[in-house]
């Protein structure tokens, strides 16, 4: 059964998200469950480190993008939000909080601002930003 949730403040058009736990979950209360992942969008602006700590306090991590297919709802996300991607200056690579390296062709990395953290933006774009800049953020929790 598909339950329509219209998250106009989060997405740039009406997005239908399945909410039945038999299909997806369990997730923390009021989180979005989609294709075996739980997501929550936080409106308060925090720097990257504070955002990471907030997610960790809820037994989650900042958003990790690992599949355009499984995470297709991210195509339509409004605005910019911290995700768990950081730049490693020593080798120039981008890696996730769990230490895994960003897979090629998953994100378009956009270099306009200088920094070592990245904001997620619609259509799988990652905008580099100074880690100390306050922004909204997305937490993610994998379901078992």
């Amino acid at each position: 059964i598909w339950s329509a949730v219209f998250l106009n403040s989060l997405f740039n058009q009406e997005v239908q998200i399945p909410l039945t736990e038999s299909y997806c979950g369990p997730c923390p209360k009021n989180w979005i469950c989609y294709k075996n992942n739980c997501y929550q969008f936080f409106d308060e602006s925090k720097n990257w480190y504070e955002s990471q700590a907030s997610c960790m306090s809820q037994n989650a991590s900042l958003l990790k993008v690992y599949s355009k297919e499984d995470q297709d709802l991210l195509k339509l996300v409004k605005s910019y939000h911290w995700m768990g991607l950081v730049h490693i200056p020593t080798n120039g690579s981008w890696q996730w909080e769990d230490g895994s390296i960003l897979s090629p062709n998953l994100l378009t990395i956009i270099e306009m601002q200088k920094g070592d953290c990245a904001l997620y933006a619609s259509s799988f774009k990652g905008y580099i930003e100074n880690c100390s800049t306050p922004n909204t953020y997305i937490c993610m929790q994998r379901t078992v």
């Epitope: 409004k78 601002q113 933006a121 905008y127």
Partner: antibody, heavy 127, light 108 residues
Framework: QVQLVQSGAEVKKPGASVKVSCKAS????????ISWVRQAPGQGLEWMGG????????NYAQKFQGRVTITADESTSTAYMELSSLRSEDTAVYYC????????????????????WGRGTLVTVSS | SSELTQDPAVSVALGQTVRITCQGD??????ASWYQQKPGQAPVLVTY???KRPSGIPDRFSGSSSGNTASLTITGTQAEDEADYYC???????????FGGGTKLTVL
């Protein structure tokens, strides 16, 4: 093919207004910002302002605030720049330029990488 | 300050390497892009971000950034590289775009 086609040269008297058009083709017009940049004879480039067609609201350089109006017509994929109260110092070539990156819905951030330019429109202000 | 400063003129011998610089406070926080403009023509984007090039731009053009300075380097300069070069970036104080004054490159 991706291009920006600008309207032809104009000669105006001081105090008058001029409206220059820029017709886009070959890409999704509404998704990318258009900026207007001018260049006086023998001088450098000067950003006047820009607009994201789907967003609607324009952003202007302080120098031109109140004198320039930038608009976009989605139905014809055309951007316009109108400059009023013309003076001789406004004699210049006026370029439209497309943003490299598309607009992120819900939050305006300026783009300063311009990957496509019109050929320019010469506006001469003379009495 | 909300200004980008470039040397007005630079010359280079054919086949040699030349570096054109752009300085400004905003470059501490933002990357620049570089444009080539030949007489009577519109500007062309040659590099942007952390040394990215649009398709069709030869790899002899490269960009770099350090502190408040952005640089455009042309390695093995060709006669056709003679042009004016402009940097641009974002104003530190708001949602505005700023250009440097331009550098006239002469190939000897």
């Amino acid at each position: 093919q991706v291009q920006l086609v600008q309207s032809g040269a104009e000669v105006k008297k001081p105090g008058a207004s001029v409206k220059v058009s820029c017709k886009a083709s070959g890409y999704t017009f509404t998704s990318y910002g258009i900026s207007w940049v001018r260049q006086a004879p023998g001088q450098g480039l000067e950003w006047m302002g820009g607009i994201i067609p789907i967003f609607g609201t324009a952003n202007y350089a302080q120098k031109f605030q109140g004198r320039v109006t930038i608009t976009a017509d989605e139905s014809t994929s055309t951007a316009y720049m109108e400059l009023s109260s013309l003076r001789s110092e406004d004699t210049a070539v006026y370029y439209c330029a497309k943003d490299l990156y598309d607009y992120v819905w819900g939050s305006y951030r300026p783009n300063w990488y311009f990957d496509l330019w019109g050929r320019g429109t010469l506006v001469t202000v003379s009495s | 300050s909300s200004e980008l400063t470039q040397d007005p003129a630079v010359s280079v011998a054919l086949g040699q390497t030349v570096r054109i610089t752009c300085q400004g406070d905003s470059l501490r926080g933002y990357y620049a892009s570089w444009y080539q403009q030949k007489p009577g023509q519109a500007p062309v984007l040659v590099t942007y971000g952390n040394n990215k090039r649009p398709s069709g731009i030869p790899d002899r053009f490269s960009g770099s950034s350090s502190g408040n300075t952005a640089s455009l380097t042309i390695t093995g300069t060709q006669a056709e590289d003679e042009a004016d070069y402009y940097c641009n970036s974002r104003d530190n104080n708001g949602n505005f775009v700023i250009f440097g004054g331009g550098t006239k490159l002469t190939v000897l």
